[in-house]
Every structure is written in C-alpha cells, then in structure tokens.
C-alpha cells in the first residue's frame, strides 16, 4: 500500500479476439426485487477526486456523529479517526456515544509508507444518502497514524468494502458490508460510479463538486450507458479478477497472460493509479511512448513524478493511445474488454504551473503486488460489485471524461482460450497482504 498511490496510503494464450464472436446473451436472468432501477437518494452521494479518494457521508454512534468516509474496495476494515489529528476537521468521539461497545482489542495496520493503529469496538452506523437502515458494525477507532490521513482530503475514516479474509487483525472481524447484508434486507451488492473531473479541483471546488455515486444494494441505470459486462470474482478476499489480454491502441502487448495477474489483479477504489506488474508496466510504457513518439516527455513523467503542462485547453489527447484490458467473461472461452482514454490515465493536478496551464501526472505506475485497477480505471466505468453472484460488472460510465473523437468502452464478447491459465496461484504462506 503506497501513500499517494494506494489511498489513503497508498495507481500466446491470453485472449486474442479470433474474429469469432459469441452470441450476446439475450435472456436476462430473473432480477431480485429492488436490485435494479432508480436509487435517487444514493445518486451523487460521493465527493472527492482520484488523487485523494472518494468519500461518502456516514453517521456513527448515538446521537449520530457525522463523518466523511473514504470508499475503499481494496481493504476490509471500517476505521475512523478517533483522536485529534492536524489533518482532521472532526473525529469519532466514542465517549459521546451511548451505543458504543468496546471490544477490548487493538488493531495495527502497517503499510509500506505509514500505518494506523487503534482500538476495536462496535457502534450503530448509518449512511444518510444510502439505504434507510442502521446497523451495528465493527469500528476501528484510530488513535495513532502516520501518513494515513491526507491534508485537505476532507475524509476522516475509511470504509473497507472487500472481504473478511483481508480484515485486520484477522478474518473473524466482520466487515461493514457483511454486517449490513446480515442485519438488513439490503441485497448483497453495491455499485460505484467515480467521476473524475478531467481538470484539477481546488479545495472549495472539491467541497462543492459531485464525485460520483455509491449505490448500496443495487444498480442505477441512469449511471451508465450500453451493457453491463461481468467478470468473475476469482477469490473473495480482495475483489480479484483475471486479465487475459492487454492492448495499447489496439496493439496486443503479447505477454504471457499470467504476467498481467502476477501476483493478482484487483479492483480497488482506494488506489489512485492503474498499477501494473513490473514487466507489464515496462512493456506498456514502451508501447505508450511509441504511440506518442512525435513528442518526447521527460523520464520523470513516465515515473509519475514530473508534471507535463500544456496551455489551457490545448492538451493533445489524440497523441496518447487508448488502453484496453480484456477481462475473463462469465461464459467459457469468452472475454470482454474495457477501454480507457488518456483522459483517465493522465491525472489533472492542482494548478502548479500557471492559471493558463493544464498540468497532468502519468497515472500508470509499477507494482510489486500485481495489477491494481484503481480510480483512473474506475473513473471510466460504472462498476458493479455483485457479491451475491461473485462477479464484477463494468459498463461505460455516464460521467466519464472524453472528447469528441473517442470514448471509453466496454465491448464483447471475444473468444479467448485457456483463460484459467492466466490466473496466478499465490503460494500459501502467512503473508501480510497489506504490506504492499
């Protein structure tokens, strides 16, 4: 987990479309009541931006204490600031809650850079712009942290939406969403629409801006266009998926597809970048450079360090390629692809040059822990975390940033053989999954 990249702390066989197209499934499976349609009260309930995370308003305790909570599909703890901190406007005051119960147990979560630690307890939790329910959930009251909270981010805690297997201190600590589903009639599914601004936002603009939507218990048709395509959740720990092919401007990277998933591929709203395994990153950057070879950008730009600035409104989007990730489909030997634009992988940075400039960071970076499909990927799509059916759906987001020439896309089906071989089997050791 890396600060600035992993928020809040923290970026042969495989899948050639053979020309043969599989028939599109026309028979929709029966829907559970209330799972689809309109969720007006939840639309636009997120704020923030990809560089500092997207947050939802939650209330904790009795009487309710309102906090902004980072939505993180890459972890499984509900943890909130519970002591004064220079970067926190407010924090959870357990002593003021009549419904707080102490679990008399500590929790310590280290990251590559930074950490948080706290005390476990339970309390009543609700989401004002979410389902009209209150649940008793586990809460880690953060009493000490280092490089965890982000100055100016406007959130005070983190909502880990992944599975119990990666909860800290261990998998016996029930994550919030499990508690929600168990204690209410909310269907075991949520969906995220993260809306990147496409331009830098200053503090007041972020506070006034709409960052997107977290639809708890369903799918809102107004948040996407076209069809939803589903990929299986390989294993219920992180939201792990399998990438079977990668293309830059339609050119296959031609790597063994195992490399794309070494040692895993996850969908993580708490990571800023699209993070790729070292070999894949190097091949992708080489291909992106080749596609934009009329220009030469500084080495530090490709490392995600230097900013490249253009006169406002003149960013040459057309010289940068589109990137397609092919994901394993639900049907045997069938895949689909999601395609993002430079508008997603060049991240606008708050005005550091002049007001006449648009400045960007390259938001694809190297990973030693597998592929992480972070906010820059998710900002192109409406993403459905269908836990009940162990699958993740992608559709083109109604709010994604694009130009008049190109748009993000979700397309399929494609014939892809031996996709199971693309998954990497992690040796079963007692590894510390969060130490990434």
């Amino acid at each position: 987990t890396q600060h600035g990249i992993r928020l809040p702390l923290r970026s042969g066989l495989g899948g050639a479309p053979l020309g043969l197209r599989l028939p599109r499934e026309t028979d929709e499976e029966p829907e559970e009541p209330g799972r689809r349609g309109s969720f007006v009260e939840m639309v636009d309930n997120l704020r923030g931006k990809s560089g500092q995370g997207y947050y939802v308003e939650m209330t904790v305790g009795s009487p309710p204490q309102t906090l902004n909570i980072l939505v993180d599909t890459g972890s499984s703890n509900f943890a909130v600031g519970a002591a004064p901190h220079p970067f926190l406007h407010r924090y959870y005051q357990r002593q003021l809650s009549s419904t707080y119960r102490d679990l008399r147990k500590g929790v310590y979560v280290p990251y590559t850079q930074g950490k948080w630690e706290g005390e476990l307890g339970t309390d009543l939790v609700s989401i004002p712009h979410g389902p009209n329910v209150t649940v008793r959930a586990n809460i880690a009251a953060i009493t000490e942290s280092d490089k965890f909270f982000i100055n100016g981010s406007n959130w005070e805690g983190i909502l880990g939406l992944a599975y119990a297997e990666i909860a800290r201190p261990d998998d016996s600590l029930e994550p919030f969403f499990d508690s929600l589903v168990k204690q209410t009639h909310v269907p075991n599914l949520f969906s995220l629409q993260l809306c990147g601004a496409g331009f830098p936002l200053n503090q007041s603009e972020v506070l006034a801006s709409v960052g997107g939507s977290m639809i708890i218990g369903g799918i809102d048709h107004s948040l996407y266009t076209g069809s939803l395509w589903y990929t299986p959740i390989r294993r219920e720990w992180y939201y792990e998926v399998i990438i079977v092919r990668v293309e830059i401007n339609g050119q296959d990277l031609k790597m063994d597809c195992k490399e794309y998933n070494y040692d895993k591929s996850i969908v993580d709203s708490g990571t800023t970048n699209l993070r790729l395994p070292k070999k894949v990153f190097e091949a992708a950057v080489k291909s992106i450079k080749a596609a934009s070879s009329t220009e030469k950008f500084p080495d530090g730009f490709w490392l995600g360090e230097q900013l490249v600035c253009w006169q406002a409104g003149t960013t040459p989007w057309n010289i940068f390629p589109v990137i397609s990730l092919y994901l394993m489909g639900e049907v045997t030997n069938q895949s689909f692809r999601i395609t993002i634009l430079p508008q997603q992988y060049l991240r606008p940075v708050e005005d550091v040059a002049t007001s006449q400039d648009d400045c960007y960071k390259f938001a694809i970076s190297q990973s030693s822990t597998g592929t992480v499909m972070g906010a820059v990927i998710m900002e192109g799509f409406y993403v459905v975390f269908d836990r009940a059916r162990k699958r993740i759906g992608f559709a083109v987001s109604a709010c994604h940033v694009h130009d008049e020439f190109r748009t993000a896309a979700v397309e399929g089906p494609f014939v892809t053989l031996d996709m199971e071989d693309c998954g990497y089997n992690i040796p079963q050791t007692d590894e510390s999954t969060l130490m990434t």
Epitope: D299, E305, Q306, V308, C309, D357
Partner: antibody
Framework: QLQLQESGPGLVKPSETLSLTCTVS??????????WGWIRQPPGKGLEWIGM???????WYNPSLKSRVTISVDTSKNQFSLKLSSVTAADTAVYYC????????????WGRGTLVTVSS | EIVLTQSPATLSLSPGERATLSCRAS??????LAWYQQKPGQAPRLLIY???KRATGIPARFSGSGSGTDFTLTISSLEPEDFAVYYC??????????FGGGTKVEIK
C-alpha cells in the same frame, strides 16, 4: 564533442523579425534523447526560457512569447532556428541555444550566446 | 505558478571559504531542481541536476541538497574561478521554463 553555435544578425529594427540559427556539430540533432532549446538573457538580468523543439518538429513555447515565436528544425543541416516577430527594445538580450538532456529536463549543453540588439 | 526565490541576492566571501546558496520554491518541486553557474561574458553551465547529482566534469566541492521546497547549493571551499552568478531552475512542471533570480557570489 558536441558543440552548439548561434548565428544571426546582431541588430534588428523594432517591429521586424529576429532570426537566429543554432548549428549543432559533433553529434546528430536527430538523436531522440534530446530537445533543443532557446533561452535569452536581457543585459544585467536573469534567464528566460523561450522554447524548444524535438527533431520530429514538436515544439514547446513560453506562453508569454508564444504568439511571436516560431522554432523550427532542419535535420539535414543539423540546425534549429528561432524566429521572434514584432520585436521591441525589450527583446534586446543575449540569445543562447542549448540542448535539453538528462531525461529531457535540464539544459546540459549551451552555445556561447549571441547578443541581439533591437534598435532603429 | 511555481516561483523560485534565491537568497541572498549577493554573497561576499573570500577564497577558501564555504558558500551556501539557497533556492526556495513556492510549492514542492520534489527533487526536480538544477543549479547553473554563469561567469561574466559566458553561457551558463549545468552544475547540479536532480537536486543533488553533479553534472559531468563538475568538481566535488560543489554539492546540492534539499527536496520539496528548500534547496541548497554548497561550495565547500571557494576557488577563484567560482566567483560567478548561480541560478536554480525547477523542472517538476515541464517544459522546463522556471529559473530563479540568481545569486551573485563575489570576492569580499
């Protein structure tokens, strides 16, 4: 070793166009690792970046000068050129050409400079 | 706009003394900062890039340090040929167009 040499008129009349050429010797301008830039320095003052060019012809200009500046490259002659239109006395300066190296970020090799005076 | 402020404007020292020049950025530039030396009637010369890396052929008495917003160029023991004007430049935002105003190191 690689050398850069500026050439062009030392005196230009107001409202006319200043034209300078930088000749690169001892190496090819077409080597993809570098941009080639222009910087100027008014008498007794600091350094001001004008702009730069890649061998492909891709250019980057200082926004404050952009409307008046054109930088071009002639790979066959191993030269790149600067044109600055509608000059005034404020454009009087020593003009340097330079190579932008070290990850195309820093001016790691400079010409000796040529003084251009704008006066009628 | 990132502004680079150099101080002092003038530094009066004797040969053999230690010179410490400061460059402060109005916001973080990470380690993307360079130092140039310019002698009268000559073109600038790259001394330090990446905040602390010496350019080819630069003597070891020149060293750069700092990251973020505060940077220092140190000349451990001034030689007669070191009396010149020194400029810093940030390239965190690219293209590389921002220079500091300069510090003149003169003989006391």
């Amino acid at each position: 070793q690689l050398q850069l040499q500026e050439s062009g008129p030392g005196l230009v009349k107001p409202s006319e166009t200043l034209s300078l050429t930088c000749t690169v010797s001892g190496g090819s301008i077409s080597r993809g690792s570098y941009y080639w830039g222009w910087i100027r320095q008014p008498p007794g003052k600091g350094l001001e970046w004008i702009g730069m060019i890649y061998y492909s012809g891709s250019t980057w200009y200082n926004p404050s000068l952009k409307s008046r500046v054109t930088i071009s490259v002639d790979t066959s002659k191993n030269q790149f050129s600067l044109k600055l239109s509608s000059v005034t006395a404020a454009d009087t300066a020593v003009y340097y050409c330079a190579r932008v190296g070290h990850g195309v970020s820093y001016f790691d090799l400079w010409g000796r400079g040529t003084l251009v005076t704008v006066s009628s | 706009e990132i502004v680079l402020t150099q101080s002092p404007a003038t530094l009066s020292l004797s040969p053999g003394e230690r010179a410490t020049l400061s460059c402060r950025a109005s916001q973080s530039v990470s380690s993307y900062l360079a130092w140039y030396q310019q002698k009268p009637g000559q073109a600038p010369r790259l001394l330090i890039y990446g905040a602390s890396k010496r350019a080819t052929g630069i003597p070891a008495r020149f060293s750069g340090s700092g990251s973020g917003t505060d940077f220092t160029l140190t000349i451990s023991s001034l030689e007669p040929e070191d009396f010149a004007v020194y400029y810093c430049q940030q390239v965190y935002t690219w293209p590389p167009r921002t220079f500091g105003g300069g510090t003149k190191v003169e003989i006391k």
